[in-house]
């Protein structure tokens, strides 16, 4: 038989991570595999169909996501959709192939929202979540000793589909659920000057724990104010929600794990500033097999998309794609086994969620809701060489930190500063505010 | 040849305005009169097929009304869509229509992003829209002398598809392009104590002209908390938009035309309160026809839809889809006529664009981009008998108020407040900081 | 009305010392950097010195790094440019200019100047 | 530190033309470019901010584009009142650099 897998992802723009040149290769790499192996889907022929979630300009679309998704179900009748990967492209399809019964896998569509299934019914995202970057954040406050207070900062940039308002709204959600904790959260425009003057006074005022999601250049200049006004690494902690490790990447940027680095006459001050700072990403898959496919899917990338994929976190996306269709192949193999059909979308779904895999991306776990359990790399500065590297990975299926051997968190007092400082953050403390002399009553 | 209408609006739940229970009569009506004039489509059979735009719950659905308008285009490809109302039913259908080069007529969705029609392509918008709103409240702005300041609230309800959201963007956005003022705005939860003491603390900070979106209890409640903390009408002034009048209506609710009137013991400070108070809202069509098509409507909507329709200004909505939709009949009828086709809806819809037109709902005029010019009425006491009565008029077309003979605008110290006052919000203006003897020197 | 007024230029020997001083009004001083920019006569703008704030960051040209001093007081609204071991080639207009940023880590332009204060070093 | 080399030094044109003035910088300074316009006795002016934004009060004539290390300043109609010298400035590093001017004046 024939199954067809209807495609909604960015044809022409190669910038998202979940943009056809990128997940393309990533495809044909997973339906060589079904073929080579007489386990999967046997005398079935997979074919995909493709439909683009851009505009004209380009741009992830809320319009033309949905609109190919309508054009590809009603020409094809696919047994899938692969993808919208960016938010509010996915948004949209995502409630249609719910409301047809279609099952949707994608490795993009992070956002909170998408985590609802009585409305994203069918939809699996064999991909990291913005929700599960709130586990990773609360297992790091319980082990920090953190469970009073966070202060969560999050950027606005024109043209960036409001990627740090959806990171931050799944961190926030989550935490709160997780941690009896308060967190503020505060949104600045990083091309607008007076909005820096506002952080730097609301800063001190909420929060000692700060998380920042921002451009590597928003970020630094936030440090090199805080340095400025005092915010030191003994009282504060800033944590750069830098999921895909921009600014340690170094390229036409900072030099490759020195996020500080520019050039630019600030340096000196950005390294000492930079000792407040630590650097949440998504984890490096470190198993060969990982290695291997990067191998392969840059080959293909460039041999049939002429699209040189560059090096860097990224790739794990395309990786969760190929990853997630091998997957849901399976489940389907399995479904026809028991009598089922390509088209009962419920029952092939259910065989994909609360479910282990061995992938390329290494041990994966789709969660009973069909959301992958996410691992998560928190990096600091060697204060030898100002050099980041990875000191703790969390392991989203066990929910466990785990600690690089050999190499510690580094803290100016050798601890943890407090979440809220001694005398509270308007010195509202009693104790704090009583005559100096009162000691000798 | 034949002609299809496909409308997509609420087909079961009958509270929305433009509820197919109350829309449905409006639109036999029109089809009656198009049988009925040899000068209109002549030989051209007109049909309706129906989508509902609700979800299962009978709620407005951003995805069962473009799903219904994607059926509804595959299985009939009609000519024109009609509807939907719901802002958030009609932002995705518009974006596909648009994409299909289809017309789109409603008399709703009045949300200030419909106006943007490169987006909203051949959508024509034949009620009222927030932003002509900011056209009124800019002359009256004008005529009054209010061109420094205003302040702006707005009431979040659960399940109210943020109306008064939409309403005040559309407003403020329109109000600060047409005068160069400095306007803020809040949000406030009707079921939040909290919220209430906030917005005390806020409005003598920040306005003495104060517009506000509110069920009327919500209104009536902030007009209490006003006179309690001594906001009188001597220095601010409290404008309800209660665009559909439901505050003066009678029935369950207040008093017709007292608002101020609930019979639980606080009618007397509520009376008093409400001298700082106006009203705003559409303006009731005051022409003979519209009064003859009410009697209409209400029988057809009997008789039909078992359906019975309550008076108010909630009826300028179905008025307004047959005016539209006659509109859109004449812009055919002339398309033919030059020798184009249904199909042709570019050139259909510019000639209903910038046109005038004598409806039922009386003069009617579209704008340049496919916009109504809107009427309103502001409504004052009397401070005779406490009964709230219009005493002015806006005419959208000719962008004037027109004042009702006989009646005044009713300022407690005989002209309106100033919208800054005199020493500034916080005190600030050095002339009232000095000490009170300089004077003698 | 936003204003800057520089004073306490004038005509020093090389080799002394001379403050420079400009007063700030209508607007909220401690919201932003301040910069201090010369002229010599006939010739271009060049960039002296800047600082932050608070203080917390103070930049130099490396033609006046170690000789100049540059400081504010935000209770007077006031900024400062103490300039030892003066040159001839220091001679020029001197420009106080406001920032359009809090800090000198931001890239905010230079929106508000002064008329400028004359400096000649000469013997 | 940071080169900002301009380019002509100076121009002749007439009222009407199109006025174009480039600036580089000797490394990536992003978009964090600025131009100033100054007339004779006078103090300088802001007229873009970050390589196109224009300030407010400033004609829409001007105009500014480029990042990284190439920019340009265009003036699309010339007025009398636009005679003057212009500069370029980066606000990416420290110390803060101009370029050495480009005089406009009357053909």
């Known amino acids: 038989g024939n199954l067809t897998v209807a495609v909604v992802l960015p044809l022409a723009n190669t910038s998202y991570p979940w943009s056809w040149a990128r997940v393309g290769p990533a495809v044909e790499l997973a339906l060589a595999q079904v073929k080579a192996r007489p386990d999967l889907l046997p005398g079935w022929t997979v074919r995909t169909v493709l439909g683009s979630s851009e505009n004209a300009l380009g741009v992830c679309s809320d319009t033309a996501a949905p609109l190919a998704a309508v054009d590809l179900k009603w020409e094809h009748n696919p047994a899938v959709f692969l993808g919208p990967g960016c938010v509010y492209a996915a948004a949209p399809v995502g409630r249609f192939t719910a409301h047809w019964r279609v099952p949707l896998l994608t490795a993009g569509a992070p956002a909170l929202g998408f985590g609802v299934k009585d409305e994203y019914a069918l939809t699996t995202r064999a991909g990291p979540s913005y929700a599960k970057l709130g586990d990773f954040v609360a297992a790091l406050h319980r082990r920090l000793g953190w469970e009073r207070q966070a202060l969560m900062l999050y950027a606005y940039r024109p043209g960036d589909e409001e990627h740090c308002f959806f990171l931050v709204e799944g961190l926030f959600m989550r935490v709160r659920d997780r941690l009896n904790i308060t967190v503020d959260h505060l949104e600045f425009a990083e091309d607008d000057l007076s909005h820096y003057t506002r952080l730097l006074r609301t800063m001190p005022r909420k929060g000692r724990v700060i998380y920042i999601c921002s451009s590597p250049d928003a970020f630094r200049t936030l440090m090199l104010l805080a340095l400025e006004a005092g915010l030191c690494g003994e009282d504060y902690v800033f944590f750069h929600l830098d999921i895909f490790g921009q600014s340690l990447q170094g390229g036409q940027g900072p030099a490759p794990r020195r996020p500080w680095e520019r050039g630019d006459g600030q340096d000196v001050s950005a390294r000492q500033a930079f000792q407040a700072a630590k650097i949440i990403t998504y984890k490096d898959p470190d198993n060969p097999e990982y290695l291997e496919f990067l191998k392969q899917l840059k080959h293909l990338a460039y041999e049939q998309f002429n699209f040189t994929m560059e090096d860097g976190l990224v790739n794990t996306i395309p990786a969760s794609f190929h990853d997630g269709l091998l997957l849901y192949i399976q489940a389907v193999t399995e479904t026809l086994a028991h009598g089922g059909t390509v088209t009962d979308g419920e029952n092939i779904t259910q065989r994909m969620w609360n479910r282990s895999f061995q992938g390329v991306t290494g041990y994966l776990k789709i969660d009973s809701s069909g959301d992958r359990e996410t691992d998560f790399s928190l990096w600091d500065m060697d204060p030898e060489n100002g050099a980041f590297r990875v000191v703790l990975n969390y392991n989203g299926t066990s929910q466990e930190l785990v600690a690089v051997s050999g190499r510690k968190l580094n803290w100016p007092l050798g601890y943890p500063p407090p979440d809220i400082p001694k005398c509270g953050f308007d010195n509202e403390d009693p104790a704090c505010n009583q005559d100096h002399l009162s000691t000798l009553e | 040849g034949n002609l299809t209408v496909a409308v997509v609006l609420p087909l079961a739940n009958t509270s929305y305005p433009w509820s197919w229970a109350r829309v449905g009569p409006a639109v036999e009506l029109a089809l009656a009169q198009v049988k009925a004039r040899p000068d209109l489509l002549p030989g051209w059979t007109v049909r309706t097929v129906l989508g509902s735009s609700e979800n299962a719950l009978g709620v407005c659905s951003d995805t069962a009304a473009p799903l219904a308008a994607v059926d509804l285009k595959w299985e009939h490809n009609p000519a024109v869509f009609l509807g939907p109302g719901c802002v958030y039913a009609a932002a995705p259908v518009g974006r596909f229509t648009a994409h299909w080069r289809v017309p789109l007529l409603t008399a709703g969705a009045p949300a200030l992003g419909f106006g943007v029609k490169d987006e909203y392509a051949l959508t024509t918008r034949a009620g009222p829209s927030y932003a002509k709103l900011g056209d009124f409240v800019a002359a009256l702005h004008r005529r009054l002398g209010w061109e420094r300041q205003a302040l702006m609230l707005y009431a979040y309800r659960p399940g109210d598809e943020e109306h008064c959201f939409f309403l005040v963007e559309g407003l403020f956005m329109r109000v600060r392009d047409r005068l160069n003022i400095t306007v803020d705005h809040l949000e406030f939860a009707e079921d939040d104590l909290s919220h209430y003491t906030r917005l005390l603390r806020t409005m003598p900070r920040k306005g003495r002209v104060i517009y506000i979106c509110s069920s009327p209890d919500a209104f009536r409640t902030l007009m209490l908390l006003a006179l309690e903390a001594g906001l009188c009408g001597e220095d601010y002034v409290f404008f309800h938009l209660d665009i559909f009048g439901q505050s003066l209506q009678g029935g369950q609710g207040p008093a017709p035309r007292r608002p101020w009137e609930r019979g639980d013991g606080q009618d007397v400070s509520a009376r008093q309160a409400f001298q700082a108070a106006k009203i705003i809202t559409y303006k009731d069509p005051d022409n003979p026809e519209y009064l003859e098509f009410l009697k209409q409507l209400k029988h057809l909507a009997y008789e039909q839809f078992n359906f019975t329709m309550e008076d108010g200004l909630v009826n300028t909505i179905p008025a307004s889809f047959h005016d539209g939709l006659l509109l859109y009949i004449q812009a055919v009828t002339e398309t033919l006529a030059h020798g184009g086709t249904v199909t042709d809806g570019e050139n259909i819809t510019q000639r209903m664009w910038n046109r005038s037109f004598q409806g039922v709902t009386g003069y009617l005029k579209i704008d340049s981009s496919g916009d109504r010019e809107t009427d309103f009425s502001l409504w004052d006491m009397d401070p005779e008998n406490g009964a709230f009565r219009v005493v002015l008029n806006y005419n959208g077309t000719s962008q004037e108020l027109v004042a009702v003979s006989g009646r005044k605008l009713n300022w407690p110290l005989g002209y309106p407040p100033p919208d800054i006052p005199k020493c500034g919000f916080d005190n600030e203006d050095p002339a009232c900081n000095q000490d009170h003897l300089s004077t003698l020197e | 009305e936003v204003q800057l007024v520089e004073s306490g230029g004038g005509l020093v020997q090389p080799g002394r010392s001379l403050r420079l001083s400009c007063a700030a009004s209508?607007?909220?001083?401690?919201?932003?950097?301040m910069h201090w920019v010369r002229q010599a006569p006939g010739k271009g703008l060049e960039w002296v010195s800047g600082?932050?704030?608070?203080?917390?960051?103070?930049g130099y040209a490396d033609s006046v790094k170690g000789r100049f001093t540059m400081s504010r007081d935000n209770a007077k609204n006031s900024l400062y440019l103490q300039m030892n071991s003066l040159r001839p080639e220091d001679t020029a207009l001197y420009y106080c200019?406001?920032?359009?940023?809090?800090?000198?880590?931001?890239?905010?332009?230079?929106?508000?100047w002064g008329q400028g204060t004359m400096v000649t070093v000469s013997s | 530190d940071i080169q900002m080399t301009q380019s002509p030094s100076s121009l002749s044109a007439s009222v009407g033309d199109k006025v174009t003035i480039t600036c580089r910088a000797s490394?990536?300074?992003?978009?964090?470019l600025n131009w100033y316009q100054q007339k004779p006795g006078k103090a300088p002016k802001v007229l873009i901010s970050?390589?196109?934004s224009l300030q407010s009060g400033v004609p829409s004539r001007f105009s500014g584009s480029g990042s990284g290390t190439d920019f340009t300043l265009t003036i699309s109609s010339l007025q009398p009142e636009d005679f003057a010298v212009f500069y370029c400035?980066?606000?990416?590093?420290?110390?803060?650099?101009f370029g050495q001017g480009t005089k406009v004046e009357i053909k």
């Open positions: 200019a406001k920032d359009m940023g809090v800090s000198l880590a931001l890239w905010g332009a230079f929106d508000i």
């Open positions: 209508g607007f909220t001083f401690d919201d932003y950097a």
């Open positions: 600082i932050s704030w608070n203080s917390g960051t103070i």
């Open positions: 490394q990536n300074i992003r978009t964090y």
């Open positions: 970050t390589a196109s």
């Open positions: 400035q980066q606000s990416f590093g420290i110390p803060r650099t």
